[in-house]
Interface confidence: low
């Protein structure tokens, strides 16, 4: 029977610098169980080396010298008794590139180099990047464990050193950032920032890094309401806004959050199932009416929580004046002025630019004021005839503005008749 020496191993293998590779291998050799049982030794040699005195790259023979440059990096894996010659190569170096052959020795009879099945190893530049693993989504305030690992790396060779960098890590102890794992409690402001893990093999020039952009989920922390690009002041979840009646109003509600909160506007203080008047962050009123006083609520809905702000709208108006108009009545000249304003205005009468305040002590004039709905009325009664042409004015004012009107009273009662005095406003 012909002696059978066979080796199953791949012809070539490629590995990136600094990484590991496992080369599966099996062999057979002639052996009879009635032989004596000397130990079975196997060896991997660099191609071209002479087995009898060359240093090996890997062996199970404790008495053979191993090349210092492959010591601990090239290892036999598996059970050689079961004819497993698999070779593990760790922390691959450029200088490892080349051919290798396998040899078996057992007693005097079995000494064989499998020269016809050489292993060609090619070490290429490191392009593999580490992976940063963490459970997504990152949630603001929730501690999350991140780990950094390099696919294809293993324990062989000098240890790997890690360094983490990124704005989200600023408060951490520097020592923490030198481990392959770290615990991060992200903040809303960490959303969109970069986190980098860099790996380096101690004593080697090989470094690689991976940068990820953090996607931090966070509920809205604040709501800001903008009018014409200017933020309104918010106190205790309420903002106050005075608006001129009839004016167009465009408000923008903003609630930074990730993913973006669903923003909506409601009239008044809404119930949970209320229907919004706007399903965006924008509230537009073409003409503000006094009926809209009371306000609106901007609500930001988010999977992690919701927030709302009440906008107390105070609708104001400049005084609107009707009059004055004057007529002769039994008790004398009766002048009336009507006005409307929010807030309610003050009013004064003038006779020839001289203010008429209260009621005359001599009884020469009398002022009465009343209000009905949004309008207020004031009347002035002048007793007696006119000695000359007179100008009667009424003026209404509030904090937002004033308006006045006047009428020229012509001398001689006959000129006036009983109707309205001709006015020169």
């Amino acid at each position: 029977e012909k002696p059978v020496y066979e080796l199953q191993v791949q012809k070539s293998v490629t590995v990136q610098e600094g990484l590991c590779v496992l080369v599966p291998c099996s062999f057979s050799y002639p052996w009879r169980s009635w032989y004596s049982s000397p130990p079975l030794y196997v060896y991997w040699f660099r191609d071209g080396e002479i087995p009898y005195y060359a240093e090996v790259v890997a062996t199970n023979n404790p008495d053979r010298r191993v090349k210092p440059e492959t010591q601990g990096r090239f290892r036999l894996l598996g059970d050689v008794q079961k004819k497993n010659c698999s070779l593990s190569i760790g922390d691959a170096r450029m200088e490892d590139t080349g051919s290798y052959f396998f040899r078996v020795e057992r007693g005097r009879d079995v000494k064989y180099s499998y020269q016809q099945n050489k292993l060609n190893l090619e070490v290429t530049a490191l392009i593999e990047k580490p992976d940063i693993h963490f459970l997504e989504p990152l949630e603001s305030g929730r501690p999350t464990r991140l780990s950094c690992s390099l696919p294809g790396s293993c324990e062989a060779g000098p240890p790997l050193t890690f360094s983490w960098t990124g704005n989200a890590l600023s408060p951490l102890d520097p020592e923490t950032t030198r481990s392959s794992e770290l615990t991060l409690t992200p903040r809303p402001e960490d959303h969109g920032t970069n986190l980098t893990c860099q790996m380096k093999r101690q004593g080697a020039q090989v470094t690689t890094e991976r940068t990820v952009q953090l996607n931090v989920s966070y509920a809205p922390q604040t709501i800001t309401i903008f009018r014409n690009g200017i933020a309104l002041e918010i106190l205790q979840n309420t903002s106050y806004l005075p608006v001129l009646e009839g004016q167009a109003l465009r408000l923008l509600c903003d609630a930074p959050s990730n993913p973006p909160a669903h923003l909506s506007w409601f009239q008044g203080s809404p119930a949970l199932n209320a229907t919004p008047i706007s399903n965006t962050g924008i509230l537009e009123l073409r003409r503000v009416r006094s009926a809209e006083e009371g306000g609106f609520t901007c609500r930001a809905q988010h999977p992690l929580g919701f927030l709302q702000i009440f906008l107390n709208l105070s609708v104001y108006s400049l005084p609107q004046l009707l009059g004055p108009s004057c007529s002769w009545e039994a008790e004398g000249l009766h002048c009336r002025c009507s006005f409307r304003a929010r807030p309610a205005p003050s009013l004064c009468w003038r006779l020839e630019e001289k203010p008429l305040e209260g009621n005359s002590s001599q009884g020469s004039f009398k002022v009465n004021s009343s209000s009905a709905g949004p309008w207020a009325n004031s009347s002035l009664i002048l007793h007696g005839g006119l000695s000359s042409d007179l100008k009667v004015s009424c003026k209404a004012w509030n904090i937002y503005g004033s308006q006045s009107g006047s009428v020229l009273l012509l001398q001689g009662r006959s000129n006036l008749g009983t109707g309205v005095v001709p006015a020169a406003l």
Partner: antibody, heavy 118, light 107 residues
Amino acid sequence: EIQLQQSGPELVKPGASVKVSCKASGYSFTDYNMYWVKQSHGKSLECFGYIDPYNGGPYYNQKFKGKATLTVDKSSSTAFMHLNSLTSEDSAVYYCAFYYGYYGVPYWGQGTLVTVSA
Amino acid sequence: DIVMTQSQKFMSTSVGDRVSVTCKASHNVGTSVAWYQQKPGQSPKSLIYSASYRYSGVPDRFTGSGSGTDFTLTISNVQSEDLAEYFCQQYNSYPLTFGSGTKLEIK
């Protein structure tokens, strides 16, 4: 009162297509996403996808992509789901429902039974 | 996709009893979970939103609890009209996903 009124049951042949409608009333139609949910006989509920009536933009669950086309007609406040290349696997009750952000899915249509049979 | 697991397919209870239906999410979904009741031949009825809030008109014997990944719907003082199938649903991320359902049987 908010209501979602769906079209009636459909019996169709394999390979054919069908269009299910959902008419919304009682709220501002363009303000909320309209969801379509599938429930096969005796099984759980599966989200088919949704459409934003405001801009007509659909989102399809990857599992059902290519099976349905979602559209809306804003003028009649109606959402449509067009199912194509029907097989017996598509026999199910299809519901429309509107999604209200933080509040989930408070309102559902009465469902439309689609039966695919030769 | 987030998987919502309702491990109990059937639950048996008596009128007046208290029963808890559980639901587990494969990822943290915060409190974005809703519960629905479905009776044969009817569309689902919304019971609970945001894990613990009852929709208006839902009897207060229905209560929801939980956050993160574990959620519970509790029905205290079970009534015969509560005979139905109950589904949980997450709306934390698309696509919205539902549990497989738990059928409540009245002894």
